[in-house]
């Protein structure tokens, strides 16, 4: 089924990922800018 394929492969083929994360402070323990996932 589709749901099983989706589970096995992690994400539908051809779907665009989220934008690259932004690390605005340059600090090593910073958290990235939050972006919505685009799945």
């Amino acid at each position: 089924s589709y749901s099983m394929e989706h589970f096995r492969w992690g994400k539908p083929v051809g779907k665009k990922r989220r934008p690259v994360k932004v690390y605005p402070n340059g600090a090593e323990d910073e958290s990235a800018e939050a972006f919505p996932l685009e799945f």
Epitope: R17, P19, V20, V22, Y23, P24, G26, E28, D29
Partner: antibody
Framework: SLEESGGRLVTPGTSLTLTCTAS????????ILWVRQAPGKGLESIGM?????DTYYATWAKGRFIISRTSTTMDLKIISPTTEDTATYFC???????WGQGTLVTVSS | DIVMTQIPASVEAAVGGTVTIKCQAS??????LAWYQQKPGQPPKLLIY???TLASGVPSRFKGSGSGTEFTLTIGDLECADAATYYC??????????????FGGGTEVVVK
């Protein structure tokens, strides 16, 4: 910080692997990009690895480069270099000010 | 793949003046755009992300605007230290058939 290594003079067709090493953070926790800059030219994005390990390449770079990582490093393999691959290669932590200083690859016969 | 078109390739302005650089994306990238400044022999420095948000330590003389496909970087009250090459960068998400990360060709800013 990030540091690239492995750049050197190679002859066309001789594969070369560049290594990106992080200090102060784990590469596997961040999105990492590979960018290059030919002498006197602009920036060119080669490919990237998301923090979850998914890898994507620019269309022109598919089949020419392989991005992989270990627990401590990120590698960029240039499969069969040509003279057009002569450039400084940077690894970059996502969109940020965390860039390595770059490593120079020269491809010449 | 995304294509970023940046104009002009070079611009000259006097100290205290204003420079405007434009960047056009080949398809909508929402606000996933950054601006970098690069000086010879150095890696690029992040100025702006999310099209209009100033990175830490960047003076407010730098202003980014735009969304979708059209973006602008404005540098006001030019200083000699602003002489550099500026790049826009898309950092849109990628897929198996689309690579969303691309740089503009760069704009050299000469300060007189």
């Amino acid at each position: 910080s990030l540091e690239e290594s492995g750049g050197r003079l190679v002859t066309p067709g001789t594969s070369l692997t560049l290594t990106c090493t992080a200090s102060g953070f784990s590469l596997s926790a961040y999105d990492i990009l590979w960018v290059r800059q030919a002498p006197g030219k602009g920036l060119e994005s080669i490919g990237m690895m998301y923090d979850d390990g998914d890898t994507y390449y620019a269309t022109w770079a598919k089949g020419r480069f392989i991005i992989s990582r270990t627990s401590t490093t990120m590698d960029l393999k240039i499969i069969s270099p040509t003279t057009e691959d002569t450039a400084t290669y940077f690894c970059v932590k996502g969109v940020s000010n965390i860039w390595g200083q770059g490593t120079l690859v020269t491809v010449s016969s | 793949d995304i294509v970023m078109t940046q104009i002009p390739a070079s611009v000259e302005a006097a100290v205290g003046g204003t420079v405007t650089i434009k960047c056009q994306a080949s398809q909508s990238i929402d606000s996933s755009l950054a601006w970098y400044q690069q000086k010879p022999g150095q890696p690029p420095k992040l100025l702006i992300y999310s099209a209009s948000t100033l990175a830490s330590g960047v003076p407010s003389r730098f202003k980014g605007s735009g969304s979708g496909t059209e973006f602008t970087l404005t540098i006001g009250d030019l200083e000699c230290a602003d002489a550099a090459t500026y790049y826009c960068q898309s950092y849109d998400g990628s897929s198996s058939s689309y690579y969303g990360i691309g740089f503009g060709g760069g704009t050299e800013v000469v300060v007189k």
